[in-house]
Structures are given as C-alpha cells and as structure tokens.
Interface confidence: low
C-alpha cells in the first residue's frame, strides 16, 4: 500500500490518457506519508468474455465513513502504467464514468464492481484498482495488487456487408457465364442449321405430303 500525501488526482478520464514512466510511479509510491494507507483487494486473475468484456470486484477496507470515493483503474504493462478510466462517486450513488469510457461500474458498500469493455488480446495485462477516500478528511489511498486480465480474440467473423458483396460478385459471374454459354451454343446451333446461306429463301416442293407434325410426348407411367 502506498500514500500519495494530499495529492488528489484530477486525472482526465479519457481512455488510456496518461502514461507514467516507471520512475515517476516509483517516486509517487515512496513519497513521505501524509495520509493513511488502506487495504484494497481484487481478484488475482480474470478472464475476459469472447466479446471482450471483463468484470471484477475491487473491495476496500474503509477505515472511516467516506462520502466521496474515487476509483481509478490502471493498466501495468512492462515498465509503464496507463490510466484506463476513473470515476468519483458519492457513497450510495451510482458510479459514473465518462460517456466514452470503456469502463462501467456499480458500487455496493465498500465494493466496486468494475466492468471493462472492448478488450482485445493485446489488452491482456495487469489491471490495478486504486481507491481514494476523498472526503471527509483524512484522505486515504489504497492500491490493489492488480488483476491479471486475460483476453483472447474470437475467431474473426466475416463482415455481413462483405459477404453480400461476395455473393453479388459470384452470382453476377455465374449469370454472365451462363449468358455467354447460351450465346455460344445458340450461335453454334444456327451455324449447323444454315451452312453458307445467302439470305435468299426459295420455296421448295415438299418431299412429303404436308400434314400436321405429330408431337409424341414422353410417356410417364404412374403406378
């Protein structure tokens, strides 16, 4: 646990905005203590759903009756700590993150249920819960040990629009192919019927008496 004196984080809440170098974090964690440390617990491991949603509980041992609490989620990767999101709430009220935040949450007593959305495999990492009891004094700060969030990317699903384009292209191709095939076969048939015709028709005497051509349909026996 570490205390940041009376510094209050007026962090901007846009996504992953601030990246602190490790040296700065080290400095912050070992500033002379002007405040009181508080125990924060969070699960060691959480698995994100296939839709990239991870939920975990951040629980703090509140030493007093705080009315204003600030919760910050930090992501630690390699030597850098990045702020993912933050929210300040009044005890008994809903936790409100910015509209464009990837985090949502609910509070219940000393528990904050945090949900991070839109996670991808590259977002796998250690997510640290930081809780600050802002009001009334004294100021308390607690930093959890972090929750390792594992994220797997689901098998990529082809875009439905893309599929429609493929379908249109294939059907168009097939249409033109059948059109071409029909045209070629028709021209071949015509060539076979009238070899070297000059385009002048001469009435010829019939070789057989003219009569109705008999059409013999196929006989399909029905049992």
């Amino acid at each position: 646990m570490a205390c940041l004196g009376f510094q209050r984080h007026k962090a901007q809440l846009n996504l992953a905005t601030r990246t602190w170098p490790c040296t700065l974090l080290f400095f912050l964690l070992f500033i002379p203590v002007f405040c009181k440390a508080m125990h924060v617990a969070q699960p060691a491991v959480v698995l994100a759903s296939s839709r990239g949603i991870a939920s975990f509980v951040c629980e703090y041992a509140s030493p007093g009756k705080a009315t204003e609490v600030r919760v910050t989620v930090l992501r630690q990767a390699d030597s850098q700590v990045t702020e993912v999101c933050a929210a300040t709430y009044m005890m008994g009220n809903e936790l409100t993150f910015l509209d464009d935040s990837i985090c949502t949450g609910t509070s219940s007593g000393n528990q904050v249920n945090l949900t991070i959305q839109g996670l991808r495999a590259m977002d796998t990492g250690l997510y640290i819960c930081k809780v600050e009891l802002m009001y009334p004094p004294p100021y308390y700060l607690g930093i959890g040990n972090g929750t390792q969030i594992y994220v797997i990317d689901p098998e990529p699903c082809p875009d439905s629009d893309f599929l429609l384009w493929i379908l249109a292209a294939v059907s168009s191709g097939l249409f033109f192919y059948s059109f071409l095939l029909t045209a070629v076969s028709l021209s071949k048939m015509l060539k076979k019927r009238s070899p070297l015709t000059t385009g002048v028709y001469v009435k010829m005497p019939p070789t057989e008496p003219e009569c109705e051509k008999q059409f013999q349909p196929y006989f399909i026996p029905i049992n």
Partner: antibody, heavy 124, light 112 residues
C-alpha cells in the same frame, strides 16, 4: 520464495479428527484461494474443496459435506483443513494448492502452486 | 459430476520420441467466454503435482515448450514433442469448469 508449507504426517484412529495446516509465503495470501486435494495410496487425485483466502467463502465437495471444514488465518497466511469422523478410506496424502479465484464461488482455473503434501493415516 | 477419462493408462516412451495423451470429458468444458476449462498436471515420482497447461492450451510459466495442449469441448490432447527422461511420472487432466473439480484417472509415462 513463493511456497506452501504443510504440517507433518498424522496417524489417527477411526472416528477421530485431523487438522492439516498450509502456510503460504512469498505472495499476497488474500489475493488467492486455497484448494485441498487428496490422494489415496496408489490412487488418483480427488478435489475436496476450496476456500477464499480473502473473505473465507468456501465450496466443499458434496461427498465430504458435513465432515470437512476449511478455514484461513490471514494474520499468519495459513489455511487449515479439518476432517472429522475419520474412516480408513480417508488414509491419503492431503495437498493444499493455490487457485487464482479469490472472492467468488464458481469457476476455477488452475492450481499453480502446491504444498508438499501431508500423509494422514487412519488406522485402528 | 463431470467424468474425466484418460487414455492410455500407461505409456512407455523412448527419449527423443513424441508422446500423446488423450483426455475426454462427459460434458463440454467450453465456457461461453471462449475458454476451455481444462488443465494438465504432472506428478513426478514422490512429488506433488505440478501445473503444465491451463485453460486447454496455455503453458504454465517455467514449463518447457515441448509440452503443448490442444482440443476443445470434450476432447483434449497433451503432446510432448520430444520426451526427456525427466518427463516420467503420472499425467492428470482436470476439469475446472464446475465443482466438484474432477481429475482423470492418470496416465503413467515411463521410459522403455
């Protein structure tokens, strides 16, 4: 050094109780759960139950319900497993194993750290 | 309870050769989050079990890359690309989807 150190071997009579301890060191005890797994001589592994080192939530195997109690002492980072009304078929090596589930019952993931085991012999 | 069935019971291997162990569960271990809740453990003679593979195919830290896990749903396989003498012992699969957590009967790998 990250480890789970278990108490020594025990010999008990049928009907008696046994309490096995498992002391964690090298990691934050309350960030994990502790499972107990036993192995009868020459047999496979059998899961007995789980306890959250964070808040004491438990989940016991139905087969042992009523006979087993799992507890933790966060001040000493120690987990305990007590088995009552011992029978001869309770003779086994009892292992404690760390699990990343801390606060909720339900889905578990893996046991990444095991104790060396405690042999409990039940014999008249 | 979910029943875990392993095969073969015994597997004599030659060092340097590959080996494969199968594990089948009585119901699917695929969670809606996309993970298969199946782990593989190795218990070397006279030792505690040690984690090899978790969530179906993830190698635990410190486990040599000759070990790999595959499969989904109800059928899983542990493969050792080139068996080494230190790989002898009993291999167990375990389902971690629901309690009671259950183990397979074990596969004893020994050097020929």
């Amino acid at each position: 050094q990250v480890q789970l150190v278990q108490s020594g071997a025990e010999v008990k009579k049928p009907g008696a109780s046994v309490k096995v301890s498992c002391k964690a060191s090298g990691y934050t005890f309350t960030s994990y759960g502790i499972n107990w797994v036993r192995q009868a001589p020459g047999q496979g592994l059998e899961w007995m139950g789980w306890i959250s080192a964070y808040n004491g939530n438990t989940n016991y195997a139905q087969k042992l319900q009523g006979r087993v109690t799992m507890t933790t002492d966060t001040s000493t980072s120690t987990a305990y497993m007590e088995l009552r009304s011992l029978r001869s078929d309770d003779t086994a090596v009892y292992y404690c194993a760390r699990d990343p589930v801390t606060m909720v019952r339900g889905v578990h993931w893996y046991f990444d750290l095991w104790g060396r085991g405690t042999l409990v012999t039940v014999s008249s | 309870d979910i029943v875990m069935t392993q095969s073969p019971l015994s597997l004599p291997v030659t060092p340097g050769e590959p080996a494969s162990i199968s594990c089948r569960s009585s119901q699917s271990l695929l969670h809606s989050n996309g993970y298969n809740y199946l782990d593989w453990y190795l218990q070397k003679p006279g030792q505690s079990p040690q984690l090899l593979i978790y969530l179906g195919s993830n190698r635990a830290s410190g486990v040599p890359d000759r070990f790999s896990g595959s499969g989904s749903g109800t059928d899983f396989t542990l493969k050792i690309s080139r068996v080494e003498a230190e790989d002898v012992g009993v291999y167990y699969c375990m389902q971690a989807l629901q309690t009671p957590l259950t183990f397979g009967g074990g596969t004893k790998v020994e050097i020929k």
